[in-house]
């Protein structure tokens, strides 16, 4: 590509940055940016707080704090004054049916009878086979097991009381938490006599039997976590150290590592080509053609025709060719990318505090989510409680004629019913009154608030890190010229001057994300519709919005870097970042892909390392460890392994997101440096010697011939 042509291309994306003798890295003298958006954001937050207060005032905090029995009466109040705890007949059915939406709408309701009790059961117990024919009085009341629903006759047969779900068929040693009786973590469920694997115990404990054969999985999970939490923390510590080590060692091994990874990808593609060729050759010799197959929606059928493998072969060959050409013609750009990665590793090493900034982001995100969840929960519990008819198993004989979900009076339980276990249970809250009528709008406001605040917190993190890393790049003498507290000063600077700009960027992203959520909701509602045109249009819309979100995230990220450096408003920063990147589009693509490859490998290394270590440790395959390092005895050894792996992934993602931000910031600074400076005494380059060497440039030596120390 000729120089003139390049100049023309560059002109299309604005003029290169002019030299500014006063520029010394992140501008000190700034003014507030995007003030209107800042005011709008602060007003919105104020509104969000008002919504929270309204939710708190109109919501029923007792619904969250106090448990309710099956009739909707509060435990520990009124008629249940001496019975403060709620006992679930089959708590496992709660685990199987609880999700964030049901909790937000109904509180902690479960599809199992619930009764207020004066104390939680202390011993494990199950109705014995020989007790089914006894009386409720003999089995429950005389044994101080006062856990039946109120009003169950003393001389009622136990079996019929269980079938009607008037009494619990088993009890677990429980401790009160949140006013509810929750099983102890190390409890072993007693055997359920007289129950074979092919018959289920009545609806009250069907979930229990199905999932476990008389010993529920969740109890075992609690046990396992109780035994292995310490070692999971150790595994997460290893993940933390591995992530740090990988980033810090990049300055030494980035070059060879990138080369090995690229060759690895080439090798994988080459093997893919070979495999596709072999499959194609075999099927061609057999004469297995697509014309014989005809049209089919069974995708696996396409594996047995030669055209499939030929197409795959062509695609892989094209990718291989592209990668080889990139390797040959863009090796200079790859070398720049490697040098920038090394530089980023140095930057992180100089400012180790940046590695732990994700913790701040995490805490802020947690606050945003918790505030939204509480507000949503309290909004959902505003209004009068409503009750509906409900049965645990509506397919039982006698339940056909019952109108499930019709409203009822909880004080008048439906005893005159042919449907076993039919009850009048709490469903939700009515929508009478101004707050209740505006409930949907307030919840929408809350969701908007959630997305906007989350995106703002993430934007804050990006801008703060960009400010810190930019101060590293633009320090002429490293580390002497780096500010004392780069992260803290960047944080204060960002909050003080650029809240509005971050809010602007976050709002744009929020609107796209909300549009995507609405689209997903519509798609979910249209799942049943088999109209291929509608499905296709929906798919296109979703794809476009996904791409738009990706682009906006990319643009925002670079805009925040520019804001951190120059302190201009969002639009100017976004434009400058975009034009700067477009003037260097090939470098952008190469760096982006090389960084992606490297960070993917880093995550793989951390997660894989922790995974392998966890596997060998928790499965007891590591022999000869001391008594202090003995692996715990577990029901499911894969549980702590999976927890360790997921934790390691979160930790690695946190660290590498900082590193990624560092690379992006240094890259933008590097491009600015190239355009702003020329290596003369007046305008020296700020980049490292290795980058200068790769570009074939150098800084003029000062008259006294003393080389500047980098």
């Amino acid at each position: 590509m000729g120089g003139k042509q390049r100049d023309k291309d560059d002109e299309a994306y604005g003029k290169p940055v002019k030299y500014d003798p006063s520029f010394r890295g992140p501008i000190k003298n700034r003014s507030c940016t995007d003030v209107i958006c800042c005011v709008l954001f602060l007003l919105f937050i104020l509104g969000y707080i008002v919504v929270g207060i309204v939710a708190w005032l109109y919501g029923d905090p007792r619904q969250v704090l106090y448990p309710r029995n099956s009739t909707g009466a509060y435990c520990g109040m009124g008629e249940n004054k001496d019975k403060p705890y709620l006992l679930y007949f089959n708590i496992f059915s709660c685990i199987l049916s609880t999700n964030i939406i049901s909790v937000a709408e109904n509180g902690l309701q479960c599809p199992t009878p619930q009764v207020c009790v004066s104390s939680c059961p202390e011993d494990p117990w199950t109705v014995g086979k020989n007790q089914f024919s006894q009386t409720v009085g003999e089995v429950f009341y005389t044994k101080n097991r006062n856990f039946c629903l109120p009003g169950v006759p003393w001389n009622m047969m136990v079996i019929t009381s269980l079938q009607q779900e008037l009494c619990p068929s088993f009890l677990l040693p429980s401790a009160p938490a949140l006013g509810r009786c929750f099983p102890w973590t190390n409890v072993t469920l007693p055997e359920l006599p007289g129950i074979t694997n092919d018959t289920t115990i009545a609806q009250g404990i069907s979930g229990l039997i199905d999932s476990l054969n008389a010993r529920d999985i969740s109890v075992k999970i609690f046990e396992d976590f109780a035994h292995s939490w310490y070692w999971i923390l150790v595994a997460l510590g290893v993940a933390l150290l591995l992530s740090l080590l990988f980033i810090l060692l990049l300055r030494l091994v980035a070059g060879p590592l990138v080369l090995v990874l690229i060759l690895g990808v080439l090798g994988v593609l080459a093997y893919g080509i070979y495999y596709c060729w072999e499959e194609y050759r075999v099927l061609r010799d057999k004469g297995a053609s697509i014309s014989q197959l005809g049209f089919t929606t069974n995708l696996s059928a396409y594996q047995s025709v030669q055209e499939t493998w030929l197409a795959a072969l062509i695609v892989l060959a094209v990718l291989e060719a592209i990668l080889l050409l990139v390797l040959i013609f863009l090796r200079q750009r790859i070398r720049i990318a490697i040098a920038l990665l090394k530089e980023a590793s140095k930057a992180v090493g100089q400012m180790m505090s940046t590695m732990f900034y994700p913790l701040v982001t995490f805490v802020l995100l947690l606050i945003c989510i918790a505030y939204w969840a509480m507000t949503a929960l309290y909004l959902a519990t505003s209004g009068q409680p409503q009750y509906v008819l409900w049965a645990s198993n509506i397919s039982s004989p006698g339940c056909e004629k019952v109108s499930i979900n019709t409203s009822c009076n909880p004080m008048d339980q439906p005893v005159n019913s042919s449907c076993p276990g039919l009850m009048c249970v709490f469903q939700g809250y009515s929508s009478k009154g101004l707050v209740q009528r505006s409930l949907f709008n307030l919840q929408i406001y809350g969701v908007l608030g959630l997305f906007w605040t989350l995106n703002w917190v993430l934007a804050l993190g990006q801008c703060v890190l960009a400010g810190a890393f930019a101060s590293f790049y633009w320090a002429f003498h490293k580390p002497q010229d780096i500010p004392t507290f780069p992260l803290i000063s960047a944080f204060i600077r960002t909050l003080r001057y650029h809240t509005g700009s971050l809010a602007f960027g976050a709002l744009i992203l929020t609107l796209v994300q909300i549009a995507r959520v609405i689209l997903e909701y519509i798609d979910h509602k249209l799942r049943g519709v088999q109209n291929p045109v509608a499905r296709c249009i929906m798919c296109c819309f979703k794809c476009c919005l996904w791409c738009l979100e990706k682009f906006i995230k990319f643009l925002n990220r670079n805009a925040y870097i520019m804001i951190a450096i120059y302190g201009k408003n969002f639009c100017v920063s976004a434009k400058n970042a975009f034009t700067l990147l477009m003037r260097n589009i090939v470098r952008v693509v190469v760096l982006d892909k090389v960084t992606d490859l490297l960070l993917f490998f880093g995550k793989l290394l951390v997660v894989g390392g922790v995974g392998v270590l966890s596997f060998f440790f928790f499965s007891g395959r590591i022999q000869g460890l001391g008594r202090d390092f003995k692996s715990p005895h577990l029901n499911y050894y894969w549980l702590p392994i999976m927890t360790s792996i997921m934790g390691a992934y979160v930790i690695a993602s946190g660290f590498f997101s900082v590193f990624g931000m560092c690379v992006d910031t240094l890259f933008l600074c590097f491009l600015e440096d190239l355009e702003r400076n020329d290596g003369s005494l007046d305008r020296p380059y700020y980049m490292s010697k290795s980058l200068l060497k790769i570009l074939g440039k150098k800084n003029e030596a000062p008259p006294d011939n003393k080389k500047r120390k980098k």
């Epitope: 001389n155 047969m157 079996i159 079938q163 018959t199 004989p397 006698g398 005893v415 019913s417």
Partner: antibody, heavy 125, light 107 residues
């Protein structure tokens, strides 16, 4: 097929004792609960007692409590009703009946299904 | 103890008639109610359990309904062999108890 045959009925003086037996065949006796039901001449049915499959749980009508004892011998497939301190009002046809609940079927409780032909007890001085 | 009452105590009907017998319990017995048929000089025969489920071999002209405290037995089309006394029985609360019976005779 399932069959229940009562025996041991007869004429007895008030205050005396009598033991009724019910021989079962055609099913696994030890798995089922068994009842005694009586019917006074020209009157309706009256439930007397029940014994569950393993003999551990027994329940009686208030009118016979303390005087009658229900028992079973699973090895002989036989149900018994030991009647002490008999009264004139105990005069009736005594039926044994099988309870459909076997102790294994938790899911539903059906009550009585199969009845014997009955044995007559007459309490008279 | 639970008292069971039946109405009517007796009824006269013709062959082909639809007959309904009502049984009431003094307290809630859910659907733990059985119906028995007894002919003079014979042992009772089980017809219905669980208020509405037919024992095997019982013709479908017999049907039961109700729950809680009020129950009915219906014979959709009365046949000569159906003239007998019908008893209801609760079997959930000890002592189990029978209703006084309803005698169905030929009009």
């Amino acid at each position: 097929q399932v069959q229940l045959v009562e025996s041991g009925g007869g004429v007895v003086q008030p205050g005396r004792s009598l033991r009724l037996s019910c021989a079962a065949s055609g099913f696994t006796f030890s798995s089922y609960g068994m009842h005694w039901v009586r019917q006074a001449p020209g009157k309706g049915l009256e439930w007397v007692a029940v014994i569950w499959y393993d003999g551990s749980n027994k329940y009686y009508a208030d009118s016979v409590k303390g005087r009658f004892t229900i028992s079973r011998d699973n090895s002989k497939n036989t149900l018994y009703l030991q009647m002490n301190s008999l009264r004139a009002e105990d005069t009736a046809v005594y039926y044994c009946a099988r309870d459909r609940y076997s102790g294994y079927d938790y899911y539903y409780y059906y009550g009585m299904d199969v009845w014997g032909q009955g044995t007559t007890v007459t309490v008279s001085s | 103890d639970i008292q069971m009452t039946q109405s009517p105590s007796s009824l006269s009907a013709s062959v082909g008639d639809r007959v309904t017998i009502t049984c009431r319990a003094s307290q809630v017995i859910y659907n733990y109610l059985a119906w028995f048929q007894q002919k003079p000089g014979k042992a009772p025969k089980s017809l219905i359990y669980g208020a509405s489920s037919l024992h095997s071999g019982v013709p479908s002209k017999f049907s039961g309904s109700g729950s809680g405290t009020e129950f009915t037995l219906t014979i959709s089309s009365l046949q000569p062999e159906d003239f007998a006394t019908y008893y209801c029985q609760q079997y959930t609360i000890y002592p189990f108890s029978f209703g006084p019976g309803t005698k169905v005779d030929i009009k």
